[in-house]
Interface confidence: medium
Amino acid sequence: HTAAQDNCTCPTNKMTVCSPDGPGGRCQCRALGSGMAVDCSTLTSKCLLLKARMSAPKNARTLVRPSEHALVDNDGLYDPDCDPEGRFKARQCNQTSVCWCVNSVGVRRTDKGDLSLRCDELVRTHHILIDLRHRPTAGAFNHSDLDAELRRLFRERYRLHPKFVAAVHYEQPTIQIELRQNTSQKAAGDVDIGDAAYYFERDIKGESLFQGRGGLDLRVRGEPLQVERTLIYYLDEIPPKFSMKRLTA
């Protein structure tokens, strides 16, 4: 669906300003912060969402061990620079001229430097591992039911093609969702795994980005799946470049 005509809102992004000023009086929505027009029939890019957030008032059953090159977003929020298509620019700088290189999900992948720092290309994050711990339940969830519900969630809520959900692992109380999407696999119109993971992360935290939705209520055979802790690991097509000082810290 597109932006709702009746009250002119963006179903997939509440951090927008919408008005019926599109062609033929159609509802058109622009992201807060950047003012960029967004497609309300799909997820908004993480870069535009972060920018809007900063502008707003305030198959084996074994678990996966993240690769030594996996990144975790330890830097938190920042006001990113986005390209004309809404993607992260490879180089990000703050107001004090400190710069760093990021991957396609906006996570820093180099040491911080000055304005002379070069980031030749935006390196794609092709593998995302979402690590969840759920609240204690009377018994473990049935793995196949859990797997089916999470795959359905990503397919229907986040519109992510099922082929990009590589695996769902479960060892009570830990759930791991593996998303994989190489540059060559991603066709025009495909939702990016980084955007889907970000929407999921916000949903899990009770901060839904969807218009008029209270929060994620994920159920497995009727029992609410309540997440206590979330960790997301990002693996890039090219390993990150950090100094040994950071790696041994």
């Epitope: 039911d145 519900e149 969630l153 809520r157 209270g214 929060g215 055979r221 609410p224 206590e228």
Partner: antibody, heavy 119, light 112 residues
């Protein structure tokens, strides 16, 4: 737009099986769950059971032994069967859509079908 | 099973007056992860199916007048109508969805 419509026999004899169908339009039964709720005349609401989008079911524990909920996705229908009915099962029977992952709220209801158990 | 208890069972108020009703659950409905409560309020007018008013204990649904407000957390919840209008004559039900679903017995709002 989203619509749910219950259809039932109106009158059922004691000890027989009550069968009601909920026909939906405007959404897919593979994307949303459908709940059954009943309301005896002049009384409150009682949740009976749910057919989840994935095809699994849950029932009110007090009625589990008598209740069966099934669906035919191709016909956009969810069916309720309640066996060994008695006068206490006389009620308005509603089906309602579960709002999926946005909280298990019932935002869309059918108008209900009145079922009387009497000989 | 979670038991939902509503009080009072009926409430007579004058037009323009405030109406307050209570709903108590036999166990906490709070999701500690998202800090949200699995509780909804429904309004049922005579001869009609129920209508969703409030979700997540305090989130008013689209189109619901702002005189309706929900509050509370854990096991104790309240629905308040700040200034009762004639069209608010109805029965109000709370419903938990923390563990499947249970409705409260309802509170009937009548006009004095």
């Amino acid at each position: 737009q989203v619509q749910l419509k219950e259809s039932g026999p109106g009158l059922v004899a004691p000890s027989e099986t009550l069968s009601i169908t909920c026909t939906v339009s405007g959404f897919s039964l593979t994307s949303y769950g459908v709940n059954w709720i009943r309301q005896p005349p002049g009384k409150g609401l009682e949740w009976l059971g749910v057919m989840w989008a994935g095809g699994s079911t849950n029932y009110n524990s007090a009625l589990m032994s008598r209740l069966t909920i099934s669906k035919d996705t191709s016909k956009n229908q969810v069916s309720l069967k309640l066996s060994s009915v008695q006068a206490a099962d006389t009620a308005m029977y509603y089906c309602a859509r579960d709002e999926n992952w946005d909280g298990a709220w019932f935002a869309y209801w059918g108008q209900g079908t009145l079922v009387t158990v009497s000989s | 099973d979670i038991v939902m208890t509503q009080s009072p069972s009926s409430l007579a108020v004058s037009l323009g007056e405030r109406a307050t009703m209570s709903c108590k659950s036999s166990q906490s409905l709070l999701n500690s992860g998202t800090r949200k409560n699995y509780l909804a309020w429904y309004q049922q007018k005579p001869g009609q199916p129920p209508k969703l008013l409030i979700s997540w204990a305090s989130s008013r649904e689209s189109g619901v007048p702002d005189r309706f407000s929900g509050s509370g957390s854990g096991t104790d919840f309240t629905l308040t109508i700040s200034s009762v209008q004639a069209e608010d004559l109805a029965v109000y039900y709370c419903k938990q969805s923390y563990n499947l679903f249970t409705f409260g017995g309802g509170t009937k709002v009548e006009i004095k």
